[in-house]
């Protein structure tokens, strides 16, 4: 029985190292050894790989070694299976190297936040030494939080024949661990690196992003006083790295101001003791950078109707903010 | 056995024009590359064309560009020279030629590795370009 | 276009002896690219060399070829009478193919 016709013919320009092709069926019932014919050079040149006689006849692949490996260049390749009872030749397929060249990954050696840009990290790496001079590359960034399985990516072009390269994305969290990695190809290929070794980097911090706020009614004491627990936590989607100095609370009876009173802690959790009227609680962590939004609370009047829900309470602050991902070189 | 049979050769006039013909026998043709190559009377040889075995054109000697033309049919086992615009310098015995993949020494690794050579000539169809 | 150089034009050998040619590029030529043909009075060239080194089937082992780069060289270890002809070198590296301009062997 003839060998089957090689079909699905498959070729890759890893640069520099060899140009390999692969196909179908990757196994034969009989011993079959094949021959993979190419014209190069622009169609000048002609050879054969072959697999005769070889361990690894039976074997669905073939590779050209330099210094016959030229680029730019267009290849022309057929492959012909051959068993004892005769050959089967594939269809002529043509190849473009710049479409099918695959390089080393880049190397990142450094995240860094830049002085005084918030939200930003500056990527260093090094264009892959295995890689066309001269030539456009294009890349894919992966970036995600620390603690996150899940991968954003942003793509973009660098034109540049420098070997150190810069890349700046914008509009992160603030003091926050990313991780990131890199991967690139020629502009026209289709193949991508694979993806270089994972760097980390960590966002300048800024002033606390939020408090969520909350507060426990308890029962009126004998002279009048209602105690109020006031409870608070770093709001959702804060710096996982966050740490506040302290937290700074006023409170004052409603359209009454000048009864303000103020407390300083360092707990997130403070006991107030108020009138009978209706109150305003407002609270803000701080650090070093300055102070959160602030978080409000209103307290009911003794009198005001509450139902039985209202004895443990929370005032979640949602800010107004959009988080989307813009990057800029 | 493998054989190659020029015809085609004539006495033209200059600017005249002259089809060859190589009928090939004895191999699988389109596994070959094909040359043309002349040689002047009391000259040496001298590449004219060639065409892969993809029936690319493998390029022309700077002398015969943009005045011949190679091409193959497979069909038929043959390769032909169109030549155009014949000048007296064009004069010569024209010999059709045999690219064949001949396998060089052990360059190491799984595979082996042939290239492509001259190795069967016809015996030539002489070309005259005289007024 | 790359030239090929031969020399010399013409030696005439006694036989028994050695005999070497030399084919020049004019520049850099790929071993796998480099071949000799022998032409004998009234025939067809035939493959004498090809990749510099490999010697063609049926060819004799007095034949063999050396070199690298821009220079390389054929050499007859024991000339015998069927081997006078013209000998040529052929680059096949860059286009257009060209030819040395030939070496005539003869017999002293």
């Known amino acids: 029985v003839l060998p089957a016709k090689p079909e699905n013919i498959s070729c890759i320009f890893y640069y520099e190292e060899n140009f390999t092709c692969t196909w179908s069926p990757e196994k034969e019932a009989s011993y079959t050894w094949y021959k993979v014919k190419r014209t190069y050079s622009y169609g000048y040149k002609s050879d054969i790989c072959s697999t005769d006689n070889s361990t690894r006849g039976n074997h669905a692949s073939c590779s050209f070694l330099p210094p016959t490996i030229t680029n730019p260049d267009n290849y022309t390749i057929q492959v012909e299976a051959q068993n004892a009872d005769g050959i089967m030749k594939s269809d002529i397929t043509y190849w473009n190297l710049d479409a099918i060249m695959k390089i080393e990954p880049p190397e990142i050696f450094s995240v860094k936040s830049v002085l005084g840009i918030k939200r930003m990290l500056q990527i260093k790496w090094i264009r892959p030494v295995l890689a066309p001079h001269s030539s456009t590359l294009k890349y894919t960034l992966r970036f995600r939080t620390i603690n996150s399985a899940y991968w954003m990516e942003v793509n973009f072009t660098k034109e540049d024949i420098d070997r150190d390269e810069t890349y700046n994305l914008t509009e992160l969290q603030a003091f926050t661990e990313y991780v990131m990695t890199l991967r690139c190809a020629p502009a026209e290929s289709m193949f991508w690196s694979g993806w270089s070794q994972e760097k980390v980097g960590t966002t300048e911090e800024e002033a606390p992003y939020g408090l969520d706020l909350w507060r426990v009614l308890k029962p009126a004491m004998v002279d009048g006083r209602r105690p109020v627990q006031l409870m608070w936590k770093k709001a959702t989607g804060a710096p996982v790295l966050e740490k506040a100095l302290g937290y700074n609370i006023w409170y004052f009876p409603e359209n009454n101001t000048n009864l303000t009173e103020t407390v300083n802690t360092t707990n997130q959790t403070h006991e107030l003791y108020l009138g009978g009227k209706t109150y305003w609680v407002y609270v803000v962590s701080y650090n070093s950078l300055g102070e959160s939004p602030v978080a409000t609370l209103r307290i009911p009047a003794l009198n005001e109707k509450t139902g039985l829900n209202d004895i443990f309470e929370a005032q979640k602050i949602e800010w107004h903010e959009h988080h989307h991902h813009h990057h800029h070189h | 056995e493998v054989q190659l049979v020029e015809s085609g050769g004539d006495l033209v006039k200059p600017g005249g024009s002259l089809r060859l013909s190589c009928v090939a026998s004895?191999?699988?043709?389109?596994?070959?590359?094909m040359s043309w190559v002349r040689q002047a009377p009391g000259k040496g040889l001298q590449w004219v064309s060639g065409?892969?075995?993809?029936?690319?054109?493998?390029g022309y000697a700077d002398a015969v560009k943009g005045r011949f033309t190679i091409s193959r049919d497979n069909a038929r086992n043959t390769v032909y020279l169109q030549m155009n615009s014949l000048r007296a310098e064009d004069t010569a015995v024209y010999y059709c030629?045999?690219?064949?993949?001949?396998?060089?020494?052990?360059?190491?690794?799984?595979?082996?590795?042939?290239?492509?050579?001259?190795?069967?000539w016809g015996q030539g169809t002489l070309v005259t370009v005289s007024s | 276009e790359v030239v090929m150089i031969q020399t010399p034009l013409s030696l005439s050998v006694s036989p028994g002896e050695p005999a070497s040619i030399s084919c020049r590029a004019s520049?850099?030529?790929?071993?796998?690219?480099l071949v000799w043909y022998l032409q004998k009075p009234g025939q067809s060239p035939q493959l004498l060399i090809y990749?510099?080194?490999s010697r063609a089937t049926g060819v004799s082992d007095r034949f063999s070829g050396s070199g690298s780069g821009t220079d390389f060289t054929l050499r007859i270890s024991r000339v015998e009478a069927e081997d006078v002809g013209v000998y040529y070198c052929?680059?096949?590296?860059?286009?257009?193919?060209?030819f040395g301009q030939g070496t005539k062997v003869e017999i002293k």
């Open positions: 520049q850099s030529v790929s071993s796998r690219y």
């Open positions: 065409i892969n075995w993809a029936g690319g054109t493998i």
């Open positions: 004895g191999f699988t043709f389109d596994d070959y590359g």
């Open positions: 990749g510099t080194s």
């Open positions: 052929q680059q096949y590296d860059n286009a257009p193919r060209t």
């Open positions: 030629a045999r690219e064949s993949p001949l396998r060089l020494g052990d360059l190491g690794g799984d595979y082996f590795y042939y290239y492509y050579y001259i190795d069967v």
